[in-house]
């Protein structure tokens, strides 16, 4: 699997999408886990509803929420109030029994540009008001890290 980068602004929300083959993964619950180290285990953060038919219902663990469009084949994870410590490697998983298939490897980057956190009224630089969005979901443009490319793991 290539790693897909999703970038979100610190303090705002970030939406991560994981597409999959809906037929191949029919009847399977999904999960979002955080990779602990390069070779370490993937620690479960949140998983979809225990009843697969109710996978469309949003389930939450702290600031992380998950919902699954089982017909369209898209798993969506929302990270609210993104913080620097949220930066790192994650996986979208499809569960079957005690096994888990990786749907997508994800690198979450937390953007920390200080101009994103200035009140528009206090701002001293012109033409920057577009940076001061409310904490709406950031539909990040993701990019894939090519095979062999070493990703930059952000530090917090």
């Amino acid at each position: 699997h290539n790693t897909t980068v999703f970038q979100g602004v610190e303090g705002q929300s970030l939406q991560v999408s994981c597409p999959y083959d809906s037929m191949k993964h029919w009847g399977r619950r999904k999960a979002w886990c955080r990779q602990l180290g390069e070779k370490g285990p993937c620690q479960r953060v949140v998983s979809t509803h225990n009843l697969w038919l109710l996978s469309f219902l949003r389930r939450r663990n702290g600031s992380t929420a998950i919902t699954d469009d089982t017909l369209g084949g898209t798993l969506t994870i929302t990270l609210r109030n993104l913080q620097p410590h949220d930066a790192g490697f994650y996986q979208c998983q499809s569960l079957h029994g005690s096994e888990a298939d990786t749907l997508r490897k994800v690198l979450v980057e937390v953007l920390a540009d200080p101009l994103d956190h200035r009140d528009a009224g206090d701002l001293w630089v012109p033409g920057e008001s577009e940076s001061f969005e409310d904490a709406h979901v950031e539909h990040s443009i993701s990019r894939s890290l090519l095979e062999g490319e070493i990703p930059f793991p952000p530090t917090s």
């Epitope: 970038q7 620097p84 953007l111 200080p114 101009l115 206090d122 530090t155 917090s156």
Partner: antibody
Framework: EVQLVETGGSLVQPGKSLRLTCATS????????LHWVRQSPEKHPEWVAH??????????YYAESVKGRFTISRDDSKSSVFLQMNSLKEEDTAIYYC??????WGQGTLVTVSS | DVVLTQAPLSVSVTPGESASISCRSS???????????LYWYLQKPGMSPHLLIY???NLASGIPDRFSGSGSETDFTLKISEVEPEDVGVYYC?????????FGAGTKLELK
């Protein structure tokens, strides 16, 4: 007029502690995120620590080199930000600047760690 | 950490001539929002750093338009079109894309 005035820098021995204070005026302190940046003699600036506003629960972040030894805090009622530095090392020797890392910078205070 | 490499380490310029300073990043500083989190500072002797350029190419308040910033995702240039005596000092690039914020090693500008 915007002012940031750092105080508290001095000569200390390795392993000792020091508390830096940055008193500010002339800008809306309470909603500005503030940082400490240090600069060793003849070296480039190095980001040290960062504290957010009350609305962000005064969240703090640190450079790896100071994590566990330095603590950043702020007092909005006094428009001041602080840097508590424990277990000081010789490599902590630098001028310490209080800044919003954009337009507001203090003149710096010199911390010298030497035996 | 993001490493910023500046070149040259020092530059000597005759007043009225132009000067260019380069800054290369170990990774892309372009965000998915189309913002490039590369900043330029001037530190005059005995002073604290002073912001010149924000987000790669935007002139900070009060900075003369002799200064300009440009670049791509990883390679950046600060240009001073007609150097004046007051421009003497050390120029630093800095990235504020991700923590920890990092600065380049600096380029010292002197007058001939």
């Amino acid at each position: 007029e915007v002012q940031l005035v750092e105080t508290g820098g001095s000569l200390v021995q390795p392993g000792k502690s020091l508390r830096l204070t940055c008193a500010t005026s002339g800008f809306p302190f309470s909603n500005v995120w503030l940082h400490w940046v240090r600069q060793s003699p003849e070296k480039h600036p190095e980001w040290v620590a960062h504290i957010k506003a009350k609305s962000d629960n005064y969240a703090t972040y640190y450079a790896e080199s100071v994590k566990g030894r330095f603590t950043i805090s702020r007092d909005d009622s006094k428009s001041s930000v602080f840097l508590q530095m424990n277990s000081l090392k010789e490599e902590d020797t630098a001028i310490y600047y209080c800044t919003d890392i954009l337009e507001y910078w203090g003149q710096g205070t010199l911390v010298t760690v030497s035996s | 950490d993001v490493v910023l490499t500046q070149a040259p380490l020092s530059v000597s310029v005759t007043p009225g001539e132009s000067a260019s300073i380069s800054c290369r990043s170990s990774r892309s500083l372009l965000t998915s929002k189309g913002i490039t989190s590369l900043y330029w500072y001037l530190q005059k002797p005995g002073m604290s750093p002073h912001l010149l350029i924000y987000r790669m190419s935007n002139l900070a308040s009060g900075i003369p338009d002799r200064f300009s910033g440009s670049g791509s995702e990883t390679d950046f240039t600060l240009k001073i079109s007609e150097v004046e005596p007051e421009d003497v000092g050390v120029y630093y690039c800095a990235q504020f894309l991700v923590y920890p914020y990092t600065f380049g090693a600096g380029t010292k500008l002197e007058l001939k």
